[in-house]
Interface confidence: medium
């Protein structure tokens, strides 16, 4: 019969031959001949292989640096590599999450909208009036002014994006 | 030169009560925001809750929502955890730490607490 010049799905061409691919997880030995199949050995340990291949070397999972901010996220397997995210505080600085930059704080007169998340930053926003916010922080949302009315005291001092208002005692009307 | 102490820790059976106490001091506490992390024997860090400088937002990882506190008494540079209803996953150290602008945390030397019948 001819020689094949295409092979099926999950198969490769060799030496006039249609061999199978080894399955994800498993790295090439030893191509298939005319009276042998294809021989397939697992990864190692630390090692994957996601998809049907011909590979002689599985690849290494990538490396969660702790130096660089990372940490695991999912563990890798023989089929899958590992997921790294960033540590509580920090975010990736890219999809593939190879470092991580500190979360930023939202400074006074700014409130955090968001929070951030392993992949993304705080989102800030200007406290609108009626609200203020005294510090800088990355968790601290713009809060209302306190209402001196309900304390039954008046406001002696305005609020600001940045200040509360200050309350203080009514002045009473003499007789 | 920040320094974090934690305490409280100790044994207590499941669906029992523990409040840590975090004492700083060398910075401007009322100023930063503070988190707890925890690690479970063999296990990485885990983030477990964080408060802001006014203690007036706090944000909870979701295996503790509901059972822990976190709270704050600034004219006292002092954190809290309060932890109820226990159970055998919350065995870890617990350290409460301050968020540097560098790359590592500020922490103190971490505190036991260990869930068991």
């Known amino acids: 019969p001819e020689p094949p010049t295409a092979c099926r799905e999950k198969q490769y061409l060799i030496n006039s031959q249609c061999c199978s691919l080894c399955q994800p997880g498993q790295k090439l030995v030893s191509d298939c001949t005319e009276f042998t199949e294809t021989e397939c050995l697992p990864c190692g340990e630390s090692e994957f292989l996601d998809t049907w291949n011909r590979e002689t070397h599985c690849h290494q999972h990538k490396y969660c640096d702790p130096n660089l901010g990372l940490r695991v996220q999912q563990k890798g397997t023989s089929e899958t590599d590992t997921i790294c995210t960033c540590e509580e505080g920090w975010h990736c600085t890219s999809e593939a999450c190879e470092s991580c930059v500190l979360h930023r704080s939202c400074s006074p007169g700014f409130g955090v909208k968001q929070i951030a998340t392993g992949v993304s930053d705080t989102i800030c926003e200007p406290c609108p009036v009626g609200f203020f916010s005294n510090v800088s922080s990355a968790f601290e949302k713009c809060h209302p002014w306190t209402s001196c009315e309900t304390k039954d005291l008046v406001v002696q001092q305005a609020g600001t994006n940045k200040t509360d208002v200050v309350c203080g005692p009514q002045d009473r009307l003499r007789a | 030169e920040v320094q974090l102490l934690e305490s409280g820790g100790g044994l207590v059976q499941p669906g029992g009560s523990l409040r840590l106490s975090c004492a700083a001091s060398?910075?401007?506490?009322?100023?930063?925001?503070m988190k707890w992390v925890r690690q479970a024997p063999g296990k990485g860090l885990e983030w477990v809750s964080s408060?802001?400088?006014?203690?007036?937002?706090?944000y909870y990882a979701d295996s503790v929502k509901g059972r822990f506190t976190i709270s704050r008494d600034n004219s006292k540079n002092t954190l809290y955890l309060q932890m109820n209803s226990l159970r055998a996953e919350d065995t870890a150290v617990y350290y409460c730490?301050?968020?540097?602008?560098?790359?590592?945390?500020?922490w103190g030397q971490g505190t036991l607490v260990t869930v068991s019948s």
């Open positions: 060398g910075f401007t506490f009322p100023e930063s925001d």
């Open positions: 408060i802001s400088p006014n203690g007036w937002d706090t």
């Open positions: 730490a301050k968020p540097a602008q560098v790359l590592f945390d500020y």
